[in-house]
């Protein structure tokens, strides 16, 4: 039997303090590097062990980052997004979108643009 995958999308403000080795995560996405079909957003692809993000514990792989220090990440080239993080200063505020799988219903399929695929 096919199961429908439902998601709960939540947003959270995460304040990180840049550590000795930086913020401690990798990103994918951008207008020139679409990670999810029809979505040029910026996604977290890796949380580095013992980095600032890992020690904080709230940012997760697969999260979409909506803004950095209030600056929207929409319609940015990949490298411009990277540069934005690198120049964000010591205290960095991230607005992130978590996407949690919550239920398997009776019918349906996962969409083509699912970032967890």
């Amino acid at each position: 039997m096919n199961g429908r995958v439902d998601y709960l999308v939540t947003e959270e403000e995460i304040n990180l303090t840049r550590g000795p080795s930086g913020l401690g995560f990798n990103i994918v996405g951008g207008t020139d590097q679409q990670y999810v079909s029809n979505d040029s957003g910026i996604y977290v692809s890796r949380i580095k062990e013992n980095g600032a993000a890992a020690l904080d514990g709230r940012l997760q792989e697969g999260d979409k980052i909506l803004s950095v220090n209030g600056q929207d990440l929409k319609n940015l080239l990949h490298q411009d997004a990277v540069d934005l993080f690198r120049n964000a200063g010591y205290a960095v505020s991230l607005r992130v979108q978590h996407r949690l799988q919550v239920q398997n219903g009776p019918i349906g399929h996962r969409g083509e643009g699912d970032p967890s695929g």
């Epitope: 913020l23 990798n26 990103i27 692809s45 890796r46 490298q79 993080f85």
Partner: nanobody, 128 residues
Framework: DVQLVESGGGLVQAGGSLRLSCVAS????????MGWFRQAPGKEREFVAH????????YYADSVKGRFTISRDNAKNTMYLQMNSLKPEDTAVYYC?????????????????????WGQGTQVTVSE
Amino acid sequence: DVQLVESGGGLVQAGGSLRLSCVASGRTFSTYTMGWFRQAPGKEREFVAHIGWSGSSTYYADSVKGRFTISRDNAKNTMYLQMNSLKPEDTAVYYCAVAIGSPVDSYRHSDPLEYDYWGQGTQVTVSE
């Protein structure tokens, strides 16, 4: 997970050339940042070269600059290392490595801990 398969190694005389290939699985190859490392018997793993996701940024160890060229073909899910003017000291097992995405911090290209996945390696032997 990402699988990496290297090929192209072999035995070559000093001054000769080889071209190594690294094929990576996964539909998001174009988001990978990638590198080549090598390990000679009894020595630590050593950084050789790095290439960014689009292929526009490359970095090399001083010992191979001007002789080795790293490149990638995102349509073929493949990274290459063209090795010219080979020397006996280039003899080693060559490994390709992948990091998923770009670090938001200054990238330490030569640090093996920056990479998430590793191939099994291909042997390169350069004879006198």
